[in-house]
Interface confidence: low
């Protein structure tokens, strides 16, 4: 006869490990008892359990409550046991010794491998601002046994670097994603992907990128200067910019206070029926926590009685 077992049994942390040991004997042979022990090199053998054909299962105190026989129906030649709730410390070599009648004793060894699925964590880097050089966007760390794979899934252009720490029973992997911040990255997902044999599917942690910026400001509303004439109603100037965080707008007049009746509504400056008093230089000031921008325009209100048109100057400054 001979013993049938596995060279390696792989189980995920917390699962039950079946340690197989089956005696394939000739007709009429019987198994008297099966002894299980842990036999890691450098340590004395530590008995787990004894399966006796007459007296049943005896579990050693160190494994009390953790070693069981597989559920029925059971073959009398099957000496397999279940190790409940496998932990990292269970990883190692195990031996089953089978006493048979009349063939004698047999023994076989197997290695138990306990996979520790990683618990990844993603840490965003410092605040991203347009104009910075290569900057850490995020780092992702995962620790497990064996070492997990940490990669990045994103449409954003960047560079990655990884490092690994080997521990006695596990390995930690940290991957960093660096990029040159630009406004186009705002709202883009940066996903850390962790692969590991102990996971049914890859674990993914997504970080949404936020890049602080402020676009140049420009003023709309003066495209057709002929519309800016005395008496015109509904004239308005609109300040255009965009930023992250969203900017606030402020209107001033360079050559004096805003005329009475002019309404400021955020990015829009609304005029009452135009008079020559509304002629002047208007400044839109755009700001957020990152930066500030100015754009100024010269408004010249035309008198319809006059034939000659007047030029309009647009000046942007930041």
């Amino acid at each position: 006869g001979e013993l049938e077992t596995s060279d390696v049994v792989t189980v995920v942390l917390g699962q039950d490990a079946k340690l197989p040991c089956f005696y394939r004997g000739d007709s009429g042979e019987q198994v008297g008892q099966v002894a299980w022990a842990r036999v890691d090199a450098g340590e004395g053998a530590q008995e787990l359990a004894l399966l006796h054909s007459k007296y049943g299962l005896h579990v050693s105190p160190a494994y009390e409550g953790r070693v069981e026989q597989p559920p029925p129906p059971r073959n009398p030649l099957d000496g397999s046991v279940l190790l409940r709730n496998a932990v990292q410390a269970d990883e190692g070599e195990y031996e089953c010794r089978v006493s048979t009648f009349p063939a004698g004793s047999f023994q076989a060894r197997l290695r138990l491998r306990v996979l520790v699925p990683p618990l990844p964590s993603l840490n965003p880097g410092p605040a991203l601002e347009e104009g910075q050089g290569l900057t850490l966007a995020a780092s992702c760390t995962a620790e497990g046994s064996p070492a997990p794979s940490v990669t990045w899934d994103t449409e954003v252009k960047g560079t990655t670097s990884s490092r690994s720490f080997k521990h006695s029973r596990s390995a930690a992997v940290t991957s960093e994603f660096h990029l040159v911040p630009s406004r186009s990255m705002n709202g883009q997902p940066l996903t850390c992907v962790v692969s590991h044999p102990g996971l049914l599917q890859d674990q993914r942690i997504t970080h949404i990128l936020h890049v602080s910026f402020l676009a140049e400001a420009s003023v709309r509303g003066l495209e057709d200067q002929n519309l800016w004439h005395i008496g015109r109603e509904g004239a308005m100037l609109k300040c255009l910019s965009e930023g992250q965080p969203p900017p606030s707008y402020n209107w001033t007049r360079l050559d004096g206070p805003l005329p009475s009746g002019v309404r400021v509504d955020g990015d829009t400056l609304g005029f009452p029926p135009l008079t020559t008093e509304h002629s002047g230089i208007y400044v839109c000031h755009v700001s957020n926590e990152f930066s500030s921008r100015d754009s100024q325009v010269t408004v010249d209100v035309l008198d319809p009685q006059e034939d000659s048109g007047k030029q309009v100057d647009l000046v942007s400054a930041s």
Epitope: L119, S121, E143, R163, F165, H167, S168, S170
Partner: antibody, heavy 126, light 107 residues
Framework: EVQLVESGGGLVQPGGSLRLSCAAS????????MSWVRQAPGKGLEWVSA????????YYADSVKGRFTISRDNSKNTLYLQMNSLRAEDTAVYYC???????????????????WGQGTLVTVSS | DIQMTQSPSSLSASVGDRVTITCRAS??????LAWYQQKPGKAPKLLIY???SLQSGVPSRFSGSGSGTDFTLTISSLQPEDFATYYC?????????FGQGTKVEIK
């Protein structure tokens, strides 16, 4: 306020033993790896040993491996260093220090040491 | 083990001076470097971590730079309380190792 207070230093003969303690307060002790660092008189800093937040992983400098044992009691917020077979070259001020962060409590990940105790002097001499 | 070499071993400077200390690693350690300040009879104090990040509560006159194997600690304008010994430490891998120290003395 984070505080680390070492105790247990003193004069001991070569071959003798000593147990250092470090009482921690002001932070969640079990969340942080802890380290021992020593400084011989007039010399620089030498990392001695570290232990993960849970106590499951320990690391030692080659110079103390097999002689020193680091441990912690998270219920008492206390870190220990058991020093056996002491030698003259172990004479130093021993500092306990908190690792700045810990990724996982069951493994040790070297990080900067952001809080240090005041130190306790260990003198090994006959 | 990774060896950390600081230079100079000591330097003399006056209040207001700009002081630079360098630290070289025997192999690449990315940005996993910390700087500490130690005054006589006192425990070390963390100044800089991750090569260039300022620890909370540390004055902005201290700054760090570098990556790979070469790193620098700069004190932009030396103050009386800055006369001390400065150590670099790699936290890239175990065992974490310190430089031999640089003593900043009053000229």
């Amino acid at each position: 306020e984070v505080q680390l207070v070492e105790s247990g230093g003193g004069l001991v003969q070569p071959g003798g033993s000593l147990r250092l303690s470090c009482a921690a307060s002001g932070f969640t002790f079990s969340s942080y790896a802890m380290s021992w660092v020593r400084q011989a008189p007039g010399k620089g800093l030498e990392w001695v040993s570290a232990i993960s937040g849970s106590g499951g992983s320990t690391y030692y400098a080659d110079s103390v491996k097999g002689r020193f044992t680091i441990s912690r009691d998270n219920s008492k917020n206390t870190l220990y260093l058991q020093m056996n077979s002491l030698r003259a070259e172990d004479t130093a001020v021993y500092y306990c220090a908190r690792d700045r962060s810990d990724v996982y409590s069951y493994s040790y990940f070297p990080t900067p040491l952001d809080y240090w105790g005041q130190g306790t002097l260990v003198t090994v001499s006959s | 083990d990774i060896q950390m070499t600081q230079s100079p071993s000591s330097l003399s400077a006056s209040v207001g001076d700009r002081v630079t200390i360098t630290c070289r690693a025997s192999q690449g350690i990315s940005s996993y470097l910390a700087w500490y300040q130690q005054k006589p009879g006192k425990a070390p104090k963390l100044l800089i971590y991750a090569a260039s990040s300022l620890q909370s509560g540390v004055p902005s006159r201290f700054s760090g730079s570098g990556s790979g194997t070469d790193f620098t600690l700069t004190i932009s304008s030396l103050q009386p309380e800055d006369f001390a010994t400065y150590y670099c430490q790699q936290h890239y891998t175990t065992p974490p190792t310190f430089g031999q120290g640089t003593k900043v003395e009053i000229k």
